[in-house]
């Protein structure tokens, strides 16, 4: 079985905070998936992007809001599987020749995903065909199923492309979370913020911002471009010293209304450890269970 959470190229030991992110070398984030949704059922046709993380040869983990049809109402309806394309082993979005692209066999949103507050913002894509694993395409580990999630001050990495498109409106950019700087995969290192501090920072804002127990926050009090970098649905990964593997502890979910990088605007992530049982249940075909790896 392929090992999860162990890229063929060692992730650098970043001791200093990265401002504005830096280019990821090919193979640094082999679990990173680009998810392209072209929703032809919308009028006019709608197209947006997100990220995801490979869990096995057949399953991609992502945020539910990436795969929710961008409707004119608050109803949660998934996009059709026919409108989803997943790219793996991708480095530069302008050159997809070296990447593996796959269509979706199933799109599964968490049944309790709440569009009002983004609670339970987690989803799965089952790929039409299992993808060949290799140096540039490898799965990430799932965390142990526990409600605590990552501890404050733990450092994690989040990567994303943030497709920049001059024709996309600000609203579309905000919805799809595609706010970054480069067509080459970027990554940043961010500290986990205490739940109390994050809740307080959002409660002080006007608007309905609830940071639930199914979320955690990461970022820097003083702000900086780093909080912009992850595409929605991308994995916030933390290195587990015990198993010596990278683990998907979070998924890029949402942030405040201010420009990203504003002071005391933390990024909010889905707490993956709360959903391990649900994920395993959804992937319970013999193939899914055999392939799946959870950090123990």
């Amino acid at each position: 079985l392929p090992v999860c959470g162990q890229p063929s190229r060692a992730l650098p030991n970043l001791v200093k905070r990265i401002i504005g992110g830096r280019n990821a070398e090919l193979g640094l984030f082999p679990w990173q998936a680009l998810i392209v949704v072209e929703d032809t059922s919308r009028i006019p046709n709608d197209k947006w992007f997100g990220s995801g993380a490979l869990l096995s040869e057949s399953w991609i983990l992502t945020a539910a809001h990436v795969l929710r049809s961008q409707r004119r109402d608050n109803t949660v309806i998934p996009v059709s599987k026919d409108h989803v394309t997943v790219y793996l082993g991708l480095h530069d979005v302008r050159d997809k020749s070296g990447a593996v692209n796959s269509s979706a066999a199933r799109v599964v949103l968490h049944p309790d995903f709440n569009i009002q507050n983004y609670n339970h913002d987690i989803a799965l894509v089952q790929l039409q065909e299992p993808v060949p694993l290799g140096a540039h395409v490898m799965p990430i580990c799932l965390p142990r199923p526990e409600p605590e999630g990552p501890a404050p001050h733990m450092l994690g990495l989040v990567a994303g492309w943030g497709i920049s498109n001059p024709n996309v409106t600000v609203d579309e950019i905000i919805i799809s979370g595609t706010r970054t700087l480069s067509d080459v995969l970027q990554y940043v290192k961010l500290p986990v913020v205490s739940h109390a501090e994050c809740k307080a920072s959002y409660e002080s804002r006007s608007g309905n911002y609830s940071v639930t127990e199914n979320m955690f926050c990461a970022g820097y009090y003083e702000g900086g471009k780093d909080t912009c970098l992850g595409d929605s649905g991308g994995a916030f990964v933390i290195f587990d010293e015990m198993s010596q593997r990278w683990v998907a502890q979070g998924l890029v979910s949402w942030g405040g209304p201010e420009e990203c990088g504003s002071k005391q605007v933390y990024g909010v992530y889905t707490k993956v450890s709360n959903y391990v049982d649900w994920l395993l249940e959804e992937m319970n075909s013999p193939r899914g269970v055999r392939e799946l790896q959870v950090e123990r």
Epitope: I43, R72, D73, N74, T75, I77, Q116, N117, I175
Partner: antibody
């Protein structure tokens, strides 16, 4: 082109039930929900409920929970609404709509009279 | 339940005039995650099915003339017709889709 074709007018007795249909064409029926709306003569619009054909999920206006039952038949791309225990208050035109209200049926008049 | 209140209930204007009607919701329709106000405007001409004019409070539906403009956020919304035409004779409804759906009572537009 997209069309929602509703069944013809119904004259029914108080206490009876009636089943209205809404046949969709010109788009993939399972990609969007079907909404049902009531309009009494000379009155405004009232949302009854919706059904999502891909998984038969339904949501109802509390006021119509015991009055209406929504179903679909994906093999014929048709949505149905059963109205039960009819009274004169149920006399109205009933509309179906889809693709987020971009398209509407022509309406079905239901008259409840003894 | 979210209650939608429209005013006025009716109004009569001459062709070419500007008209504004309002819609108030009993709670905010702004989704802080998607940054959208889930409010739509419909036009219903006599004997016809309703027609969607505006969604997300201010986005004009494809094919709707640009004399129709929606505005507002949170709980207060308005629909403006910059230069009323004879064919605009209709009842106009607002509808919230923030939590299920609720229509306003309607504003009847008559042409003098």
């Amino acid at each position: 082109q997209v069309q929602l074709k509703q069944s013809g007018p119904e004259l029914v007795k108080p206490g009876a039930s009636v089943k209205l249909s809404c046949k969709a064409s010109g788009y993939t029926f399972t990609t969007d929900d079907i909404n049902w709306v009531k309009q009494r003569p000379g009155q405004g619009l009232e949302w009854i409920g919706w059904i999502y054909p891909r998984d038969d999920r339904t949501k109802y206006n509390d006021k119509f929970k015991d009055k209406a039952t929504l179903t679909v038949d994906t093999s014929s791309n048709t949505a149905y609404m059963d109205l039960h225990s009819l009274t004169s208050e149920d006399s109205a035109v009933y509309f179906c709509s889809s693709l987020e209200d971009t398209y509407w049926g022509q309406g079905t008049l239901v008259a409840v009279s003894s | 339940d979210i209650v939608m209140t429209q005013s006025p209930s009716s109004l009569a204007v001459s062709a070419g005039e500007k008209v504004t009607m309002t819609c108030k919701s009993s709670q905010s329709l702004l989704n802080s995650r998607t940054r959208k106000n889930y409010l739509a405007w419909y036009q219903q001409k006599p004997g016809q099915s309703p027609k969607l004019l505006i969604y997300w409070a201010s986005t004009r539906e494809s094919g709707v003339p640009d004399r129709f403009t929606g505005s507002g956020s949170g709980t207060d919304f308005s629909l403006t017709i910059s230069s009323v035409q004879a064919e605009d004779l209709a009842v106009y409804y607002c509808k919230q889709s923030y939590n299920l759906y609720t229509f306003g009572g309607g504003t009847k537009l008559e042409i003098k």
